[in-house]
Interface confidence: medium
Amino acid sequence: DPVLCFTQYEESSGKCKGLLGGGVSVEDCCLNTAFAYQKRSGGLCQPCRSPRWSLWSTWAPCSVTCSEGSQLRYRRCVGWNGQCSGKVAPGTLEWQLQACEDQQCCPEMGGWSGWGPWEPCSVTCSKGTRTRRRACNHPAPKCGGHCPGQAQESEACDTQQVCPTHGAWATWGPWTPCSASCHGGPHEPKETRSRKCSAPEPSQKPPGKPCPGLAYEQRRCTGLPPCPVAGGWGPWGPVSPCPVTCGLGQTMEQRTCNHPVPQHGGPFCAGDATRTHICNTAVPCPVDGEWDSWGEWSPCIRRNMKSISCQEIPGQQSRGRTCRGRKFDGHRCAGQQQDIRHCYSIQHCPLKGSWSEWSTWGLCMPPCGPNPTRARQRLCTPLLPKYPPTVSMVEGQGEKNVTFWGRPLPRCEELQGQKLVVEEKRPCLHVPACKDPEEEEL
């Protein structure tokens, strides 16, 4: 199916930028992996690069405004022609749910005091209003609450006095037309306009003031223009060459408003001076290689020794990574394919341990399933041996850092009947539903 093709994908907002045009296939649009596409206008924007997870959205508002609730956030698998980590197809949403608390307490209403006395009438003649007030302190509201109703009320009042009306000018009438519209004739034409003292007229009893100034004004018609000439388009120029060497580009034709040139205030040519067309090089753009994440460290060993575990003997270990996705003469991955470090092996070593403090509360799981809960743990943490943190392997090569490697067997005193992990669980409250934000916008 044809798609809308764009030249940029904005990672921060997930939006397509720089519309190239429509009516092209996903495959042709994605000849350039920097491009992006939409299946329909306003639809989900997918970048042409290999799929990977978007940034997490901001946390949604807490599901309740006071006391403890829950909130969701999501991320989306975006990209084309592949899958995100976890073998997830592009377009798929992944959710996280956590507990939240915007305000510890909930608002409580207050009560009004009695009404105060009426204030004087707002005017000295004709009719106005008077006001009285009351206070929200009987009792005072708590935790951001308020009192129901209004803190003041007003009523009409009559001074029994008639007000005078002062005169004011209505707006000026239109200028009378000049005798000629372009390039003045034998007489200099004049134009006149007038106004009335009627907005409003001054009152008789009690007497109002008359309008100040004159009721009419006159001026000469000066600088009448020469008669205008409308502009006309010249022919379209040649089509510019395709500006890209791979994927889709945009060519342009131009024309000039000179057939004739507009003169003496005549209108410029209507329409566009340029028009564009999509051009297709039919050459796929280079795709640079990208490093996979590092593999696991190999076991910590020392040549010619069967085992160095639980001993103050430094060994070596390595890890590797793979350069994936390089196509069509793209750049190879920069950097090393293998990483080597020095290590002490504490694999399966019995070590004295101590209980950690409680961890922070984890995310609510499952985020979109029934009855989500959150958990925190205390772990039996091993106390690492005080081996030297650096070693000098070869004369003249300087000191090398040494890392502990392996999964030891920590020993702690029993805590709540447990030897390694103590876990506490709690239900998540006021859980909102998981809804695709793209579908909510429609």
Epitope: S25, E27, D28, N81, A282, P284, K327
Partner: nanobody
Framework: EVQLVESGGGLVQPGGSLRLSCAAS????????MSWVRQAPGKGPEWVSA????????YYAASVKGRFTISRDNAKNTLYLQMNSLKPEDTAVYYC????????????WGQGTQVTVSG
């Protein structure tokens, strides 16, 4: 049984032309994307050109764009590669292949035809 049989290779001088053919059988040729892939001596395979099932879209490697033209005749179940302005670096065994040219996942290959460009 799927078969792809290439022909039309040979020895040609720099600047010369050749037309390669690939006869297909054993699958629905008219609904398959097809490619030409070449392998020079001592090097890995290099994608050259591709064409979609109805012949409406064609694609070329930057190194051959403007010199090579891919085409197909679905009535004859045959794929073609017209090669003009040949250079010594075009010397290779040329294979026709069926599959996804973009991800380089090819399901079927021919046995290849040798093209040698030499003065």
């Amino acid at each position: 049984e799927v078969q792809l049989v290439e022909s039309g290779g040979g020895l040609v001088q720099p600047g010369g032309s050749l037309r390669l053919s690939c006869a297909a059988s054993g699958f629905t040729f008219g609904s398959a994307d097809m490619s030409w892939v070449r392998q020079a001596p001592g090097k890995g395979p290099e994608w050259v050109s591709a064409i979609n099932s109805n012949g409406g879209s064609t694609y070329y490697a930057a190194s051959v764009k403007g010199r090579f033209t891919i085409s197909r005749d679905n009535a004859k179940n045959t794929l073609y590669l017209q090669m003009n302005s040949l250079k010594p670096e075009d010397t290779a065994v040329y294979y026709c292949a069926q599959g996804n040219w973009y991800t380089e996942e090819y399901h079927y290959w021919g046995q290849g035809t040798q093209v040698t460009v030499s003065g």
